[in-house]
């Protein structure tokens, strides 16, 4: 595999990880994949300090971030685990909300205006925010 | 100058199978997203597959889920498509295209010629 | 999958008009909408990006406007070179990016 040893250009470099801002929506799906194809993901929040670093990017704007609960349990999309790792949560969040109209419950996860998490409908055209490590081996599948 | 030379193209009967390549030149090949779009004879413009810089992320439409396999060596510059179970419907034009994200959006700033695939018994 | 519907599917034209096509989206795509030129045994070539930000190297009587879900080429002053196939192309739906049908520009 390669390793990437510097951020692309127009991504932020913070703490050995590259961050990309987006300035417009997606549904969480299409900004996960979107992410992915960037060979990044959606932005996993593993600390104060990291939550302060994008908090100060994206402004008071809804954000999408990499945690959704659409299979079960709250999940991050890189594997970190939810249980034992950080969290930001609104006062009575998450909470699954089904009063919307739009069907069914919350499932995806978003930086609020004050930068705090909250679960919503995750069709919602939300910004976004990638991130991919600097020094990590990207592992290239074996060809067929 | 960037370059996406496609081949492999030619005639199969239904069934069968077919690897398409896509050798690329001009650019870092390993830092693009690539994608194949096809075109049916007099027809429109179909998206059928993309794969991330590093090969690690593939996606498919669901016309070809299950049948095609896209893929890529970065060491050769090189983009695959392999087509398993053809079927009539699948015969087009297939064309490789570089993708790239700019402000949030993608699009395709560079295809190559094409390679017809006809599938017919 | 997000629907994509251009209009109209051919028109003709003489060098020096002003024409404009139109692509609708079966749902708000936001500004997620790409042209493309084809001219026939060609590859298609990028034109506008963003809705409405010319690719490099394109001549500027093309532009492109709109968001939401209707959308619109332009071609400010029609010359030999443009007679082709056009098509849209959402890309808010990642990465199932579907096309329109394409207009086919003719000389009249």
């Known amino acids: 595999g390669s390793e990437r040893t510097c951020c692309p250009v127009n991504w932020v470099e913070h703490e050995r990880s590259c961050y990309w801002f987006s300035r417009s929506g997606k549904a969480w799906a299409d900004a996960d994949n979107y992410c992915r194809l960037e060979d990044a993901h959606l932005v996993v929040v593993t600390s104060w300090e990291e939550q302060k670093f994008v908090q100060h990017h994206i402004g008071p704007v809804n954000t999408w971030m990499g945690l959704h609960d659409q299979n079960g349990p709250w999940k991050w999309v890189d594997g970190t685990d939810y249980e034992t790792g950080f969290k930001n949560w609104r006062p009575e969040q998450p909470d699954d909300w089904y009063g919307h109209g739009l069907g069914g419950g919350e499932d995806c996860a978003h930086f609020t205006d004050d930068g705090r998490w909250n679960d919503d409908v995750c069709q919602r055209p939300y910004r976004w925010v990638c991130e991919t490590e600097l020094d990590k081996a990207s592992q290239e599948p074996p060809l067929l | 100058e960037v370059q996406l030379l496609e081949s492999g193209g030619g005639l199969v009967q239904p069934g069968g199978s077919l690897r398409l390549s896509c050798a690329a030149s001009g650019f870092t090949f390993s830092s693009y997203a690539m994608s194949w779009v096809r075109q049916a004879p007099g027809k429109g413009l179909e998206w059928v597959s993309v794969?991330?810089?590093?090969?690690?992320?593939?996606f498919y439409a669901d016309s070809v889920k299950g049948r095609f396999t896209i893929s890529r060596d970065n060491s050769k510059n090189t983009l695959y498509l392999l087509m398993n179970s053809l079927r009539a419907e699948d015969t087009a034009v297939y064309y490789c295209a570089k993708k790239i994200a700019v402000a949030g959006t993608h699009y395709f700033d560079y295809w190559g010629q094409g390679t017809l695939v006809t599938v017919s018994s | 999958d997000i629907q994509m519907t251009q209009s109209p599917s051919s028109l003709s034209a003489s060098v020096g008009d002003r024409i404009t096509i139109t692509c609708r989206a079966s749902?708000?795509?936001?500004?997620?909408l790409n042209w493309y030129q084809q001219k026939p045994g060609k590859a298609p070539k990028v034109l506008i990006y963003?809705?409405?930000s010319l690719q490099s190297g394109v001549p500027s009587r093309f532009s492109g406007s709109g968001s939401g879900t209707d959308f619109t080429l332009t071609i400010s002053s029609l010359q030999p070179e443009d007679f082709a196939t056009y098509y849209c192309q959402q890309s808010y739906s990642t990465p199932t990016w579907t096309f329109g049908q394409g207009t086919k520009v003719e000389i009249k």
């Open positions: 963003a809705a409405s």
């Open positions: 794969i991330s810089g590093s090969g690690v992320n593939t």
């Open positions: 749902q708000s795509i936001s500004s997620y």
